[in-house]
């Protein structure tokens, strides 16, 4: 009896596992074995198939085979008893463009009111994603095990945080990988769980805020209780995307360990040109805090963010003031290549109630003044760049009194 | 499979000094913290530091502080330990064990073990 | 430093009991705790992290549970292979420290 070729053959690739499935012709009869021959593009033989030869399932695995990824290849399958069926041709495929990204590896963290969340390819250093292994994005699932209802978060990197949550809960959550330059979506990962922890009775550090003085960064930050000791720590914001760098490593700023102030100030030159995060934890101690909300700080919009200067030329019933570049030490004006908007506050010297103006350009009008009144003025800049939302320190208040009437002109 | 694999017993006078080694295999070495363990004979189990192979950044137990060294030959994947000035209660099975990634935002659990190098201090 | 009490510091109990040893610490330590097992003349082995979550190839008879400063392993059936030392850790401050031990032996 002459055997039947096989038929519906799948190939199903997850990261760099290859896995050919395949339906018997016959199942009357027994004891057959299939293998498999492939053959490269531009290729006029057939090479066989290593670990799919005489098998005697409906599947095997070629991942040991090295392939080029990005290079056609066809595959052919016959089965064998005493004699063999014909080949029956599979389909020629790419195997990258056939590939599935597979579930990723999680690891949770839990604070009180957080889960940190460490998201890295499910196969480490994998030939299909090679020259994509930056390229990931993260998306992810999570719900409060005891509602169900679910939260997505889409377009997030190998670390994220997730915060508000609430203490003593268990959350769970599943994740998937994209790379979304070739339009690929992964599987996802296993539902992992873990629960907050109980509430730490020192609450992380609030409202962190760095400005600029002299040469110096000053770093600021709210606190609940006093007699407490901080650390504040620094990372290069790019290594979110890629903990598996081993650069990826929280660092302490020198100046900023053990402070017993909420501030710390530090030379602008212990950060290169870049953007970092910075986080800050108290202690009392004996209990140490969790971290705090991280920080994004870029040195280029930091560093030149300095307090504009001003000019005020005085009438009877307004102020005229003339914005400058500010100065560096050394009285060089900084060159601002982004756009500001600036913050003006004034005030009547005798009194505290402030008004304000905000203005984009730099010849800004504060009308309304009473005449022979001192008022008060300071202003601040703040960026335009809604991703890197920074403003500088106000500068000193300037105060001026204004003409006697009828000199408006 | 992950593997720690420690050097041979030693035997010490005191006042003198003992280096161990741990060289680990299956893992990125420089990605995790390696920690050290010491356990007196029939005690418990005593945290005595960890290192981070990738930078050589360690954080002691301050009862060891001015005694024990820990450093790393990333080429060969080896941590070493020296303790100096030993005395007769430095007696104990030394264990070199891995820690957490380094890229955590905390500390983690102990996951993989060396097999342990017993030291004796006697004159 | 935080201090670790475990108890008992030994127990007897026969194959098919259910077994269950406490962990104290001076301070709350936010679930960031460990249980080890060891076998004499073995290096420890890790059962469980982050109070409830069990290691690979761990048999699931064993669990950790517990929050703040009071934890807890069980061991639902004991096999004769589970009689053995058990040890807390807690890696929440550093030094890390460890529980005193309890010595699991049979009946």
């Known amino acids: 009896k002459n055997l039947k070729s096989p038929q519906k053959v799948e190939v199903d690739i997850i990261d760099d596992n290859f896995i050919l499935r395949w339906n018997r012709s016959d199942e009357s009869v027994g004891n057959v074995t299939f293998s498999f021959d492939y053959q490269k593009t531009g290729m006029d033989n057939w090479i066989k198939l290593s670990g799919c030869q005489n098998i005697t399932s409906t599947k095997c695995n070629f991942s040991s085979l090295k392939l080029n990824v990005y290079e056609e290849i066809k595959l052919r399958i016959r089965a064998e008893k005493e004699n063999t069926s014909s080949w029956y041709e599979v389909d020629s495929f790419t195997p990258f463009r056939k590939a599935q990204i597979g579930p990723p590896e999680v690891h949770l963290e839990a604070e009180d009111k957080a889960i940190v969340i460490h998201i890295s390819p499910g196969t480490k250093d994998s030939v299909m994603w090679a020259l994509d292994g930056l390229s990931f994005t993260y998306s992810l699932v999570i719900w409060k095990n005891s509602s169900g209802v679910e939260e997505r978060i889409e377009n997030i990197y190998s670390r994220h945080k997730i915060y508000k949550l609430s203490p003593e809960t268990t959350y769970c959550l599943k994740v998937k990988a994209a790379l979304l330059t070739s339009w690929k979506i992964g599987v996802y990962s296993p539902v992992h769980c873990i629960k907050t922890t109980v509430e730490n009775e020192l609450p992380p550090p609030e409202n962190i805020e760095v400005s600029v003085q002299n040469q110096n960064y000053v770093l600021k930050w709210d606190y609940t209780y006093a007699n407490m000791t901080f650390q504040v720590q620094w990372l290069h914001a790019f290594l979110k995307r890629n903990p598996g760098n081993h650069l990826y490593k929280w660092k302490q700023i020198p100046d900023c360990e053990n402070v017993k102030t909420t501030q710390c100030v530090f030379p602008q030159n212990v950060f290169q040109k870049g953007i970092y995060l910075l986080r800050v934890q108290a202690s009392d101690g004996n209990n140490t805090s969790f971290w705090s909300e991280e920080i994004k700080f870029d040195t280029e919009i930091q560093a030149f963010l300095l307090p504009p200067v001003f000019n005020i030329r005085s009438l009877s019933d307004s102020f005229h003031i003339y914005i400058g570049a500010p100065k560096q030490s050394g009285n060089t004006p900084v060159i601002q290549d982004y756009p500001l908007i600036y913050e003006i506050i004034f005030w009547e010297n005798t009194s505290n109630a402030e008004r304000k103006i905000i203005e984009k350009k730099t010849d800004v009008t504060v009308p309304n003044l009473k005449p022979l009144t001192v008022y008060c003025v300071k202003a601040r800049a703040h960026t335009m760049d809604e991703k890197l939302n920074k403003s500088s320190v106000f500068s000193d208040a300037v105060c001026e009194k204004t003409k006697p009437g009828n000199t408006s002109k | 499979q992950v593997q720690l694999v420690q050097s041979g017993a030693e035997v010490k006078k005191p006042g003198a000094s003992v280096k161990v080694s741990c060289k680990a295999s299956?893992?990125?070495?420089?990605?995790?913290?390696m920690n050290w363990v010491r356990q007196a004979p029939g005690q418990g189990l005593e945290w005595m530091g960890k290192?981070?192979?990738?930078?050589?950044?360690?954080h002691f137990n301050q009862k060891f502080r001015d005694r024990v060294t820990m450093t790393r030959d990333t080429s060969t994947s080896t941590v070493y330990m020296e303790l100096s000035s030993l005395r007769s209660e430095d007696t104990a099975v030394y264990y070199c064990?891995?820690?957490?990634?380094?890229?955590?935002?905390?500390?983690?659990?102990?996951?993989?073990w060396g097999q342990g190098t017993l030291v004796t201090v006697s004159s | 430093d935080i201090q670790m009490t475990q108890s008992p510091s030994s127990l007897s109990a026969s194959v098919g009991d259910r077994v269950t040893i406490t962990c104290k610490s001076s301070?709350?330590?936010?679930?960031?705790l460990a249980w080890y097992q060891q076998k004499p003349g073995k290096a420890p082995k890790l059962l469980i992290s982050?109070?409830?979550t069990l290691e690979s190839g761990v048999p699931s008879r064993f669990s950790g549970s517990g929050s703040g400063k009071d934890y807890t392993l069980t061991i639902s059936s004991l096999q004769p292979e589970d009689f053995a030392t058990y040890y807390c850790?807690?890696?929440?401050?550093?030094?890390?420290?460890f529980g005193q031990g309890t010595k699991l032996e049979i009946k």
């Open positions: 290192i981070d192979p990738s930078d050589s950044e360690t």
């Open positions: 064990a891995r820690g957490g990634r380094i890229s955590f935002d905390y500390d983690a659990a102990l996951d993989y």
């Open positions: 301070e709350v330590i936010y679930n960031r």
């Open positions: 850790q807690q890696y929440w401050n550093k030094p890390f420290t």
């Open positions: 982050g109070a409830t």
């Open positions: 299956g893992y990125t070495f420089t990605s995790y913290w």
